[in-house]
């Protein structure tokens, strides 16, 4: 929780906080949800989810994590299904709000059959 | 293959605790959210808690809710359910589920259950 | 909160028969709802998500449609072991479970 001073009440601010590793494995034809929980105020304006610098149109879904007034905290999930070899890089969830931007990235290593990360 | 086997459960009194394991094998677990899910005798099913893959975060249902901590150890591939202050109507089968990938809330893969019955 | 309703509570059908099993939610839920199937001594099984879609593994015979506050979850033609209790699962505010539905043998 952000401390706020005096002159700063009318600030905003954007917290992100990542609810599986940042540095993921899988393997290759699995599945994963990368998750983030964020608090945001003003609320949030604009998510997006980005991989090798094109915009997720699908796959994700972002919701407030309580249908109360006050709510700031949100959550947004991107969902990664049946995943090969060559999707394996770096995902990015970005969102802004009328004060601030913020991002978080992870880091997806998927294993191909030949070769896999043992847990 | 996805095994969920849950222990832990048995017979407590009224205010007292008790702890819920499940031990996971046959997928990665720390990629995947967890929840349990309860079925009181002869009657239908109640989603209770579930906790993201990291143990960061989690949702529990109101009737639970201050009562009933869930928490993982995702070193040891294990789900938990701590359980305090426990009422009669809390007296069920507990079941660990999966959560599924790209449908948060749907379970996809089942344990076969504990039971906990609270009586004195 | 959101309430999900079945109907009918018990259904008697043969073998081979088709069986309709109906769900209402309390409001809109999108598309957000799943059924599970629970034979007598076993855990549930997920049978469909959103609406529409099987899970691994399960026959071609089950379907569903729906959307908005109003679903329904059709087996085609009834094998043995479909003979179970049918539960339908809304995903779009929490996580609530209908009440059930029985299919038992006629």
């Known amino acids: 929780q952000p401390s706020v001073s005096p002159g700063e009440v009318d600030k905003g601010f954007i917290n992100i906080f990542p609810m599986i590793n940042t540095t993921v494995f899988v393997n290759d034809g699995e599945n994963v949800d990368l998750i983030v929980e964020y608090e945001a105020f003003p609320k949030p304006e604009h998510q997006q989810w980005i991989y090798m610098n094109r915009t997720f149109t699908d796959k994700w879904e972002d919701y407030p994590k309580s249908e109360n007034e006050s709510n700031i905290r949100y959550v947004s999930e991107l969902h990664l299904t049946r995943l090969k070899g060559t999707e394996g890089g770096t995902y990015t969830f970005l969102v802004s709000n009328s004060d601030v931007n913020a991002a978080i990235a992870f880091n997806v290593y998927v294993n191909t059959k030949h070769h896999h990360h043992h847990h | 293959e996805v095994q969920l086997l849950e222990s832990g459960g048995g017979l407590v009194q009224p205010g007292g605790s008790l702890r819920l394991s499940c031990a996971a094998s046959?997928?990665?677990?720390?990629?995947?959210?967890m929840g349990w899910v309860r079925q009181a005798p002869g009657k239908g099913l109640e989603w209770v808690s579930w906790?993201?893959?990291?143990?960061?975060?989690?949702f529990q249902a109101d009737s639970v809710k201050g009562r009933f901590t869930i928490s993982r150890d995702n070193s040891k591939n294990t789900l938990y359910l701590q359980m305090n202050s426990l009422r009669a109507e809390d007296t069920a089968v507990y079941y660990c589920?999966?959560?599924?990938?790209?449908?948060?809330?749907?379970?996809?893969?089942w344990g076969q259950g504990t039971l906990v019955t609270v009586s004195s | 909160d959101i309430q999900m309703t079945q109907s009918p509570a018990t259904l008697s059908l043969s073998p081979g028969e088709r069986a309709t099993l109906y769900c209402r939610a309390s409001?809109?839920?999108?598309?957000?709802v799943a059924w599970y199937q629970q034979r007598p001594g076993q855990a549930p099984r997920l049978l469909m998500y959103d609406t529409s879609k099987r899970a691994t593994g399960i026959p071609a015979r089950f379907s569903g449609s729906g959307s908005g506050t109003d679903f329904t979850l059709t087996i085609s033609s009834l094998e043995p072991e479909d003979f179970a209790v049918y539960y339908c699962?809304?995903?779009?505010?929490?996580?609530?479970f209908g009440g059930g539905t029985k299919v038992e043998i006629k």
């Open positions: 906790i993201y893959p990291s143990g960061g975060g989690t």
């Open positions: 589920a999966r959560v599924r990938v790209g449908s948060t809330g749907n379970f996809d893969y």
């Open positions: 699962q809304q995903r779009s505010y929490w996580f609530a």
């Open positions: 046959g997928f990665t677990f720390s990629n995947y959210k």
């Open positions: 409001q809109s839920v999108s598309n957000y």
